[in-house]
Interface confidence: medium
């Protein structure tokens, strides 16, 4: 069970995001649209599904958001790269959970992830990436909130 713990320094990720979030959110041209911030999507996740949703959202950011976003500012790009590397490390940790069959994906978890991907698909790719980056604090807060639940299950 110990190997399931996300040992990444969440505070470091949050600090990196805090330093860039206004610059990212300033480029968001769809204020009344949301991808993750419909927190209901994440709030209704049961403890059993937390590992799966975390795994899926990490994949969402690593495979879609970070790849789709084109950042011209090298200082901001460095911070985003740092967050991306932390997410890759977290993915590696969660793969160990999967190998121990502790990260089963039930229907509710799959549905929650699908909603987020659908929201993303409704926007033009660069606008969607900007908005998802701007909503990183929602995901980070959710991880923090569910961290204990996730690994005591």
């Amino acid at each position: 069970l110990r190997r399931c713990l996300i040992s990444t320094d969440m505070h470091h990720i949050e600090e990196s995001f805090q330093e860039i979030k206004r610059a990212i959110q300033a480029k968001d041209t769809f204020p009344n649209v949301t991808i993750l911030s419909t927190l209901e999507t994440l709030q209704i996740i049961k403890p059993l599904d937390v590992c799966c949703v975390t795994k899926n959202l990490l994949a969402f950011y690593v495979d879609r958001v970070f790849k789709d976003h084109q950042e011209p500012n090298p200082k901001i790009l460095r911070k985003i790269s740092s967050i991306a590397n932390s997410f890759l490390y977290m993915q590696k940790t969660l793969r160990q959970c999967q190998e121990q069959r502790q990260c089963h994906c039930r229907q509710e978890a799959t549905n929650a992830t699908r909603v987020i991907h659908d929201n993303y698909d409704q926007l033009e790719v660069h606008a969607a990436a900007i908005k998802s980056l701007g909503e990183l604090d929602v995901f980070l807060a959710w991880i923090n909130k569910n961290h204990e639940v996730m690994f005591s299950a």
Partner: antibody, heavy 120, light 111 residues
Framework: QQLEESGGGLVQPEGSLTLTCTAS?????????ICWVRQAPGKGLEWLAC????????TYYANWAEGRFTISKTSSTTVTLQMTSLTAADTATYFC?????????????WGPGTLVTVSS | AIDMTQTPASVSEPVGGTVTIKCQAS??????LAWYQQKPGQPPKLLIY???TLASGVPSRFRGSGSGREFTLTISDLECADAATYYC?????????????FGGGTEVVVK
Amino acid sequence: QQLEESGGGLVQPEGSLTLTCTASGFSFSSSYWICWVRQAPGKGLEWLACIDTGVSGDTYYANWAEGRFTISKTSSTTVTLQMTSLTAADTATYFCARDIFGSAIDNSLWGPGTLVTVSS
Amino acid sequence: AIDMTQTPASVSEPVGGTVTIKCQASQSISSYLAWYQQKPGQPPKLLIYSASTLASGVPSRFRGSGSGREFTLTISDLECADAATYYCQCHYHGSSYWDNSFGGGTEVVVK
């Protein structure tokens, strides 16, 4: 968490002045929009400029303020507004504010203001 | 620059009444609009952001609506403490500019 403006006072026409916005209880190391807004006596609010205190350092100005006003982050707790070629029309209370347009995460925060009087 | 036109300039209503303040932008600003309350000698206080989202600690008697060019602030069940000047403010940004223009303000007198 508080903001406080300083540096106001009496200045001659065509003179210059630098106002300072000082944060306490939080740091400008994180990314916030820190903006300057002014209010002439008995008049409405007028936006001057904003700066992203994070790594981007992006600055934005009202069209009419560009060139005469300069917003800068000078330390992890201070943001300044440099004003040049001042006229009587610049007489106002100058406010600094954090995230003036609101956010689900951070509350909007304003200083009490500092009065600038341009007169000979 | 975006012009924000606020109406009326002044309104007087009794305690318990309802006040409606309108704000019109010179171009579409989506829902990038905030409402502020200011009392004499005090800095402005944010009431509503993103056109309709209540800021923290603001009572639900305050309601914002609208998008595009037309916006409304409605204050219901008026209290004496609501006597103040109210401002709308756009915070619209393009790729290389921002506009944070304020409306001219509406003075609310509570009788």
